[in-house]
């Protein structure tokens, strides 16, 4: 089938990194600078993505694959393929409509993105606060007074808070 197809369409013989040049009797010409073709048989090469400004080049464009962008320091990627850069804040802050603001008392953020979350309420689990929370860190819950017996030390750190479902670009 491939052989038949290539007899009918000479362009199908053009590999990735080239295009089928109609102006040159359907010869396979290499993609011009700053363009690529990721599949064979293409009649044009696509322009390479340019990572400038808040976008930064993570992977250079080649004749067969597009460039990949990430974000400059102080920003992080949002969207598939890093189609958006969002401002980072410091730990202990959250991004609001007025910019980065410190977490309110009783809340924390241990990352440079995301929102401030309430400290763990140790008493809900019948435990006491072993280490106080800060803007950057959750409280550490310790055993309840009734649990305290000689040699007992069951310190329970809260579950690690992480950005759900986000994998770095």
């Amino acid at each position: 089938f491939e052989r038949t197809r290539s007899l009918q369409d000479p362009c199908s013989n053009c590999p990735a990194g080239t295009f089928c040049d109609n102006n040159r009797n359907q010869i396979c010409s290499p993609c011009p600078p700053n363009s690529f073709s990721s599949a064979g048989g293409q009649r044009t090469c696509d322009i390479c993505r340019q990572c400038k400004g808040v976008f930064r080049t993570r992977k250079e464009c080649s004749s067969t694959s597009n460039a990949e962008c990430d974000c400059t320091p102080g920003f992080h990627c949002l969207g598939a393929g890093c189609s958006m850069c969002e401002q980072d804040c410091k730990q202990g802050q959250e991004l609001t409509k007025k910019g980065c603001k410190d977490c309110c008392f009783g809340t924390f953020n241990d990352q440079k993105r995301g929102i401030c979350r309430p400290w763990t309420n140790c008493s809900l689990d019948g435990k006491s606060v072993l280490v106080n929370g800060t803007k950057e860190r959750d409280v550490v819950c310790g055993p309840s007074p009734a649990d305290l017996s000689p040699g007992a030390s069951s310190v329970t750190p809260p579950a690690p808070a992480r950005e759900p479902g986000h994998s770095p670009q």
Epitope: D46, I47, C48, R49, Q50, C51, K52, G53, V54, F55, N66, L78, G79, A80, G81, S83, M84, E86, E94, L95, T96, K97, R113, G114, I115, E163, P164, G165, H166
Partner: antibody, heavy 116, light 107 residues
Framework: DVQLQESGPGLVKPSQSLSLTCTVT?????????WNWIRQFPGNRLEWMGY???????SYNPSLKSRISITRDTSKNQFFLQLNSVTTEDTATYFC?????????WGQGTSVTVSS | DIVMTQSHKFMSTSEGDRVSITCKAS??????VAWYQQKPGQSPKLLIY???TRHTGVPDRFRGSGSGTDYTLTISSVQAEDLALYFC?????????FGGGTKLEIK
């Protein structure tokens, strides 16, 4: 498949607040991406209003900053638009959309008229 | 804000023709440009992002090109179902802005 559906009142009085809900099915709004509101005015002009990201941070169009708030209810997989002090200039079709490969999934839109 | 200008509000073409819709940004948007198609009574549908990357399921007759401030959406062989409104959008910096739209009419 990811689906978004806008809901809310079709008529709002001037100076009141406009409140809309976007219900997302087929994808958790806390998993990834940014969840946006866009509006289309009579005459077809589109305006990006703002988003709430999967992590809960927000970004707004500066032209609306003093009037807009985007929030969410993760238990219901919904996000919300509140636009305060509306005027007849806010009459538009309001869309919610996911910013994945840019604005890759949109709701059908809900028409809002501001009139007394 | 970055202003995206689509100079043609209407374009008339025939089935099978090649048509190019242009969009000009008020400053360099570094290929961070998307194109959307909106049919009457429907929401916009993503066609192209990063200036030339076709979104999943978009027919290969749609092609995006351009860099700097000048961008083009080309439909190589117009079909009747391509009758629609086409918008460009920059996704370089907030606020993300759209062009005014170009309505493609079939003769």
């Amino acid at each position: 498949d990811v689906q978004l559906q806008e809901s809310g009142p079709g008529l709002v009085k001037p100076s009141q607040s406009l409140s809309l809900t976007c219900t997302v099915t087929g994808y958790s709004i806390t998993s990834d991406y940014a969840w946006n509101w866009i509006r289309q005015f009579p005459g077809n002009r589109l305006e990006w209003m703002g988003y709430i990201s999967y992590s809960g941070s927000t970004s707004y169009n500066p032209s609306l900053k003093s009037r807009i708030s985007i929030t969410r209810d993760t238990s219901k997989n919904q996000f919300f638009l509140q636009l305060n002090s509306v005027t007849t200039e806010d009459t538009a079709t309001y869309f919610c959309a996911r910013w994945g490969y840019v604005l890759d999934y949109w709701g059908q839109g809900t028409s809002v008229t501001v009139s007394s | 804000d970055i202003v995206m200008t689509q100079s043609h509000k209407f374009m008339s073409t025939s089935e099978g023709d090649r048509v190019s819709i242009t969009c000009k940004a008020s400053q360099d948007v570094s290929t961070a440009v998307a194109w959307y198609q909106q049919k009457p009574g429907q929401s916009p549908k993503l066609l192209i992002y990063w200036a030339s990357t076709r979104h999943t399921g978009v027919p290969d007759r749609f092609r995006g090109s351009g860099s700097g401030t000048d961008y083009t959406l080309t439909i190589s062989s117009v079909q009747a179902e391509d009758l629609a409104l086409y918008f460009c959008q920059q996704h370089y910096f907030t606020p993300y802005t759209f062009g005014g739209g170009t309505k493609l009419e079939i003769k």
